[in-house]
Interface confidence: low
């Protein structure tokens, strides 16, 4: 299910994740009770076309919402995990309230106010950086954008847009925050596997869990088609057909020695004798090519206490 979030006492409007380009009616339900959400605007939470509106949202609204698109041949159901947070007491915006980071490297750059297109808003949008209102002439608010002239590293930080949603004669505040980073011109190179070492043998205990990290670096800056993955006997983990052995969902990204690196972890819930005979390949690939480090598992020798 997709996730959406908002702040207590602000407006939150969300769309059905299954919507696509459909023009068919959408019904919304509380998924825990199957209770349908009304379309009457007098309700604080109501449905309007394909949208679910919380006017205003409250912490108690957090939960999973289901939307059903009813078309003549097929009903499509989507699920949306909505979390309403209390306003952060300080200026430090927690990660869970952040929209995607914007990366800029040009002399002039623009930041878009997230989710604003869902709302009935009127200009101007107010912009804040690390909670301070932006008043320098270098910062120009235009429609749903913030334009920054002569971008430098000092412009990095958390940018919050604040606008008003109007509904039924009432105005509601909406705020959204995203980070802005300035990237130096990067470089791309043939992948380098930093872990595990080449032809490594790892000691494991039968019946115990084991995890092996595959880490590789690809250069600096944005990397097109860079990936790390595990293979078992030259088969990708997902197709190997052994439920005990899983590749960790979601690649862990890190920056090491000014290099951009990726890590994928192979987890074995309970090592068996059979696992000792398998070959485990850590693969790293990008547009420059592919590199493979093979590792094997060996039974851990018991410590001799004599």
């Amino acid at each position: 299910s997709k996730s959406s979030w908002g702040l207590e006492n602000e407006a939150l409007i969300v769309r059905c994740p299954q919507r696509g380009r459909s023009t068919y009616p959408v019904e919304w339900y509380y998924s825990d009770t199957n209770e349908s959400i009304p379309t009457q605007k007098r309700n604080r939470i109501f449905v309007s076309r394909d949208r679910l509106k919380f006017l205003p949202a409250r912490v108690e609204d957090s939960g999973i919402y289901a939307c059903v698109i009813r078309s003549p041949n097929l009903n499509k159901t989507g699920y949306l995990n909505v979390t309403i947070h209390k306003k952060p007491p300080s200026c430090n915006i927690p990660d869970y309230l952040m929209y995607s980071t914007v990366r800029g490297s040009d002399k002039n750059f623009k930041i878009t106010c997230p989710t604003i297109d869902l709302y009935n808003w009127t200009a101007p949008v107010q912009w804040f950086k690390n909670c301070k209102a932006l008043q320098e002439p270098r910062f120009r608010a235009h429609r749903s954008y913030l334009f920054i002239d002569n971008v430098t590293h000092d412009d990095e930080g958390d940018y919050t847009c604040q606008f008003t949603h109007a509904e039924n004669g009432t105005n509601y505040i909406v705020t959204a925050t995203r980070s802005f980073t300035v990237e130096e011109k990067g470089f791309s190179m043939f992948p380098v596997i930093t872990n595990p070492p080449y032809n490594h043998t790892m000691e494991v205990e039968i019946g115990k869990p084991a995890s092996i990290a595959c880490s590789a670096c690809f250069g600096k800056g944005s990397h097109f088609l860079a990936d790390v993955l595990w293979q078992i006997n030259k088969t990708v983990v997902g197709n190997f057909g052994e439920a005990r052995i899983q590749e960790e969902e979601g690649r862990n990204e890190s920056s090491s020695n000014d290099m951009d690196c990726l890590t994928s972890v192979l987890r074995i819930t309970g090592v068996t004798e059979k696992d000792l005979s398998l070959e485990y390949d850590c693969l790293a690939l990008n547009l420059h090519g592919m590199i493979r480090h093979t590792i094997r598992l060996r039974r851990k020798q018991p410590i001799d206490h004599r």
Epitope: Y30, T33, E35, R44, E60, D61
Partner: antibody, heavy 122, light 107 residues
């Protein structure tokens, strides 16, 4: 008949534990948010905790956070309040109450139990 | 947290009197306000929800009004069974908070 019936109250020493139960009947329990509200002797009403219909959303008063746990079993139509590390100031009549609107909390508490008395004293 | 202040804390009235109790919120709660009646040794009873909507089964002599921060509960003609304590409660944000109560006594 729509009814809520609390049980589990009693006398307990400071630092002790109690588990209150609230049996619901006569309505679709699994569709309603539920609350615990307490009233100290001679005092006003104080909200304690709330749980959503499917237990997605749980909230506590600051005064009980970390010590009390609200839960529900929709298959048994029962609401619970596990109270640990009890203090003298927790002495009160504890009421369970139904949220009038289903699934989100908005319309007030329209059905109340008779209450169960918790006394914390050495 | 939103503070709810009720006034008066007690009042004496006679049967047939028009009685008004006020409740003030420490911030704008729009119309998310409920009124309860509680008699000694009994559980509270919901009278009014969303500031002015009469709960089912509640006599029409009870009415509520207000929006934002100032709210009023009115009993148009006090009856013997109305002598009780009345509480307001906001349901605008967590935690839901109650006023301190207004005790309506027989004069």
């Amino acid at each position: 008949e729509v009814q809520l019936l609390e049980s589990g109250g009693g006398l307990v020493q400071p630092g002790g534990s109690l588990r209150l139960s609230c049996a619901a009947s006569g309505f679709a329990f699994s569709s309603h948010w539920m609350h615990w509200v307490r009233q100290a002797p001679g005092k006003g009403l104080e909200w304690v905790a709330t749980i959503s219909s499917g237990s997605h959303s749980i909230h506590y008063a600051d005064s009980v956070k970390g010590r009390f746990t609200i839960s529900r079993d929709n298959s048994k139509n029962t609401l619970y309040l596990q109270m640990n590390s009890l203090r003298a100031e927790d002495t009160a009549v504890y009421y369970c109450a139904r949220e009038a609107g289903t699934s989100y909390y908005y319309y007030g508490m329209d059905v109340w139990g008779k209450g169960t008395t918790v006394t914390v004293s050495s | 947290d939103i503070q709810m202040t009720q006034s008066p804390s007690s009042l004496s009235a006679s049967v047939g009197d028009r009685v008004t109790i006020t409740c003030q919120a420490s911030q704008d709660i729009r119309n998310y306000l409920n009124w309860y009646q509680q008699k000694p040794g009994k559980a509270p009873k919901l009278l009014i929800y969303k500031a002015s909507s009469l709960e089912s089964g509640v006599p029409s002599r009870f009415s509520g009004s207000g929006s934002g921060t100032d709210f009023t509960l009115t009993i148009s003609s006090l009856q013997p069974e109305d002598f009780a304590t009345y509480y307001c409660q906001q349901s605008y944000s967590t935690p839901p908070t109650f006023g301190g109560g207004t005790k309506v006594e027989i004069k």
